[in-house]
């Protein structure tokens, strides 16, 4: 039962961490216009990996589209590789997620196949939430080096006459949205890790067999198992396949009385 | 098609207040105070987002004038205390555009201080 | 507060004259973040609310004539009536719509020659 809930629960909340890194890629606030020690102005600028918005204070707002590839930085573009990256991996590991749930019942899919779907969308998911939180950290580090550099020379004089008020720009809603999206990611995928080791089928303890034949001492090993060392071994015996039930979290089998010829 | 019609001017005495008036009909969403002192130019006076109620005041204006609205009637307010006779004026509520221009102002009210 | 100066005060102009007025702000009134300056051009006639003529300093409000035209940006604006018609004669005002508070400039009264 523990299997499930946490395979279940790691898949519930990388489908969210997905959800907030797809919805932070979109947001148009990545990057909000700075109002601290500013002068009070009618027009509110803010950023996004795809277009800039001003929203003025009669309420209108207007966006406009980047487009251009060759003329962004060069730290933009990896930021949204490195976004477009963490929903492709964490889309495929959903997808491979929902199959390789023990909820779900494919056909006879083996649980050695379903763990290693597991084990499979849980490392997309780690790197996923990887890949948001290393596009979101690197955008806020830009953020705030520009923000530094913009203070230095906020103000920037004509003859000490005239004053242009630089816009400074502080994180937006955006980062702390991929922030949490991807640490909900990682945390999803570390989840479906853990619920694959408790998939995977244990070996179980098999006393093999043992048949003399005459003038030999060679013990037999049924079909179905490794080969064992000998009579009476304790060496645990992997089981390849069970056709009988089990149940649901059940981590090991026991043999029972229709194992041997 | 926006409608501005400003009502609540008249004669007051220095110290007393007044409370003006905007009906206001048509979309907006945000509205301005300005106001005109005979033979003289354009003052603004104070913005209001008619949605959040969040206003902002001139300096002169700030503590002795109050903008707000009522959602439910649809009108703008000019609240005035402490009038002054400097403060006779026409004073107009504008509606902020595109450009934060005013692109629909009312007719006007005077407003005229004096013992 | 940003200081708006209009010049000149008055004009005089004839029927198809082309005018020119200029406004000047203690501030730069252009929005890095849409490269657009934020002054607006208002026109007043005697006992009459203010009209608005030309926002973000070039744009035309619809029904304003196509005699009418802004340009400028930074700090730096101008008014141009390509060719006065009598109905034109009046006030005419600049205003700073960047920065709270919003500030007019103090008017250029156009005259009949």
């Known amino acids: 039962m523990a299997v499930t809930a946490c395979q279940g629960l790691g898949f519930v909340v990388s489908l969210i961490g997905i959800a907030g890194i797809i919805a932070a890629t979109c947001m148009d606030q990545w990057s909000t216009q700075d109002l601290y020690n500013n002068p009070v102005t009618a027009v509110f600028n803010y950023q996004g990996l795809w277009r800039s918005c001003v929203r003025e204070s009669s309420g209108f707002t207007e966006c406009r589209g980047y487009f251009t590839l060759l003329g962004l930085p060069a730290m933009l573009q990896a930021v949204r590789a490195l976004m477009i990256v963490g929903i492709v991996l964490g889309a495929i590991g959903l997808l491979v997620s929902i199959f390789a749930l023990k909820c779900i019942r494919i056909g006879s899919m083996e649980d050695s196949a379903k763990a290693n779907m597991t084990l499979t969308s849980g490392i997309m998911f780690i790197v996923s939430g990887l890949c948001a939180i290393a596009g979101v950290s690197v955008f806020a580090n830009m953020l705030v080096t520009n923000f530094w550099m913009s203070t230095a020379n906020m103000y920037t004089g004509m003859g000490g006459m005239v004053q242009t008020v630089q816009t400074r720009y502080t994180f937006g809603a955006a980062l702390f949205v991929g922030w949490v999206a991807g640490g909900l990611t990682l945390i999803g995928g570390v989840m479906m890790c853990i619920a694959c080791r408790g998939l995977a089928p244990e070996e179980t303890n098999y006393k093999a067999v043992s048949y003399h034949a005459s003038g030999h001492s060679v013990a037999y090993k049924p079909g179905g198992f490794k080969a064992s060392t000998g009579f009476g071994s304790n060496t645990k015996n992997k089981k390849i396949y069970d056709g009988g039930a089990r149940t649901e979290d059940e981590v090991q089998s026991y043999p029972s009385k229709h194992d041997y010829v | 098609e926006v409608q501005l019609v400003e009502s609540g001017g008249g004669l007051v005495q220095p110290g007393g207040s007044l409370r003006l008036s905007c009906a206001v009909s048509g979309y907006t969403f945000s509205m301005n105070w300005v106001r005109q002192a005979p033979g003289k130019g354009l003052e603004w006076v104070a913005w209001i987002n008619m949605y959040t109620g969040e206003p902002t005041y001139a300096d002169d204006f700030k503590g002795r004038f109050t903008i707000s609205r009522d959602d439910s009637k649809n009108t703008l307010y000019l609240q005035m205390n402490s009038l002054r006779a400097e403060d006779t004026a026409v004073y107009y509520c504008?509606?902020?555009?595109?450009?934060?221009?005013?692109?629909?102002w009312g007719q006007g009210t005077l407003v005229t201080v004096s013992s | 507060d940003i200081q708006m100066t209009q010049s000149p005060s008055s004009l005089s102009a004839s029927v198809g004259d082309r005018v020119t007025i200029t406004c000047k702000s203690s501030?730069?009134?252009?929005?890095?973040?849409?490269?657009?300056?934020?002054l607006t051009w208002y026109q007043q006639k005697p006992g009459k609310a203010p009209k608005l003529l030309i926002y973000w300093a070039s744009t035309l409000e619809s029904g304003v004539p196509s005699r009418f035209s802004g340009s400028g940006s930074g700090t730096d604006y101008t008014l141009t009536i390509s060719s006065l018609q009598p109905e034109d004669f009046a006030t005419y005002y600049c205003?700073?719509?960047?920065?709270?508070?919003?500030?007019f400039g103090q008017g250029t009264k156009v005259e009949i020659k």
């Open positions: 501030q730069s009134l252009l929005n890095s973040g849409n490269q657009k300056s934020y």
């Open positions: 205003q700073n719509a960047y920065f709270f508070p919003f500030t």
């Open positions: 504008a509606r902020s555009s595109r450009g934060n221009g005013f692109d629909y």
